[in-house]
């Protein structure tokens, strides 16, 4: 496969509701009509797939119904949002981009975005 540069932010802090968003940008060397984006999580030297979506250029990303990810695309940029995050989900989230169609096949893997998730403190009981 041919290499492709993928850029993503180094660090993102998830919101108090456990939502983190970041942009994944790829330098497309060809005129791809179909692109596959995969988010991988690396923690303790283990890599797991968080979510993946294939989209046609100019169309929206379609993740599986039960996916924790949503996203939109604009040109060579993909805006990714991961929901339902908890403190234990803190880790390095890597954006992998594949130009699937037409040939040639290009593969790009970003350096990863460190997502920090802090569980909100439980509200103390209030006496009125």
């Amino acid at each position: 496969c041919k290499a492709m540069h993928v850029a993503q932010p180094a660090v993102v802090l998830a919101s108090s509701r456990g939502i983190a968003s970041f942009v994944c940008e790829y330098a497309s060397p060809g005129k791809a009509t179909e692109v596959r984006v995969t988010v991988l999580r690396q923690a303790d030297s283990q890599v797991t797939e968080v979510c993946a979506a294939t989209y046609m250029m100019g169309n929206e990303l379609t993740f599986l119904d039960d996916s924790i990810c949503t996203g939109t695309s604009s040109g060579n940029q993909v805006n990714l949002t991961i929901q339902g995050l908890r403190a234990m989900d803190t880790g390095l989230y890597i954006c992998k981009v594949e130009l699937m169609y037409p040939p040639p096949y290009y593969l790009g893997i970003g350096n990863g975005t460190q997502i920090y998730v802090i569980d909100p403190e439980p509200c103390p009981d209030s006496d009125f």
Epitope: K2, T33, E34, T54, M56, P103, P104
Partner: antibody
Framework: QVQLVQSGGGLVQPGGSLRLSCAAS????????MSWVRQAPGKGLEWVSS????????DYADSVKGRFPISRDNSKNTLYLEMNSLRAEDTAVYYC???????????WGQGTTVTVSS | DIQMTQSPSSVSASIGDRVTITCRAS??????LAWYQQKPGKAPKLLIY???NLRSGVPSRFSGGGSGTYFTLTISSLQPEDFATYYC?????????FGQGTRLEIK
């Protein structure tokens, strides 16, 4: 396990039509490019057509362009090749294949024979 | 269209021999090359993808090399089950094209 099961071949007269089907199982069908490849008796392999995972993009060999539309139904995990205006030179074993890394073809159907003869 | 030319078109060899098949592309295809093995009456089987990557489950006696326009498939020590026809295929651009095949026969 991962497999492709083909159906729909047979004997047809010149000018006739056939529809080949390729049922996929064991993998996420919609994530893969799919292709048709044929092999005439005693000859080598010839690429016929490919379709993107969503079905939104298709490409064809010049020899079949306009005659053999490729399609897929991702809800049924099935690939199709509609063969129209068949000619004697279309006689071959037709294989469906899954697109693998770097546009290789990593999983192949068992093949189905199409014979065009009067 | 990119033409793929294999050589030799046929080769006779003995069990244990080292055999190399070559494939030339009419233009630069980087490493977008695959090799297949086909036995009579059977579907082709992927051996090598990306010019040099061995497909999982394929014996390590098979290896691929090359880049650009010149590629090789080497079988380090022929086994009885290796006698078959071998094809190269470029995946750099449409139309996808195959070499004409190399028939490997028992000497």
């Amino acid at each position: 396990q991962v497999q492709l099961v083909q159906s729909g071949g047979g004997l047809v007269q010149p000018g006739g039509s056939l529809r080949l089907s390729c049922a996929a199982s064991g993998f996420t069908f919609s994530s893969y490019v799919m292709s048709w490849v044929r092999q005439a008796p005693g000859k080598g392999l010839e690429w016929v057509s490919s379709i993107s995972g969503s079905g939104g993009s298709t490409d064809y060999a010049d020899s079949v362009k306009g005659r053999f539309p490729i399609s897929r139904d991702n809800s049924k995990n099935t690939l199709y090749l509609e063969m129209n205006s068949l000619r004697a030179e279309d006689t071959a074993v037709y294989y469906c294949a899954r697109g693998g890394s770097a546009w290789s073809l990593d999983i192949w159907g068992q093949g189905t024979t199409v014979t065009v003869s009067s | 269209d990119i033409q793929m030319t294999q050589s030799p078109s046929s080769v006779s060899a003995s069990i244990g021999d080292r055999v190399t098949i070559t494939c030339r592309a009419s233009q630069d295809i980087s490493n977008s090359l695959a090799w297949y093995q086909q036995k009579p009456g059977k579907a082709p089987k992927l051996l090598i993808y990306g010019a040099s990557n061995l497909r999982s489950g394929v014996p390590s006696r098979f290896s691929g090399g090359g880049s650009g326009t010149y590629f090789t498939l080497t079988i380090s020590s022929l086994q009885p089950e290796d006698f078959a026809t071998y094809y190269c295929q470029q995946g750099n651009s449409f139309p996808i094209t195959f070499g004409q095949g190399t028939r490997l026969e028992i000497k």
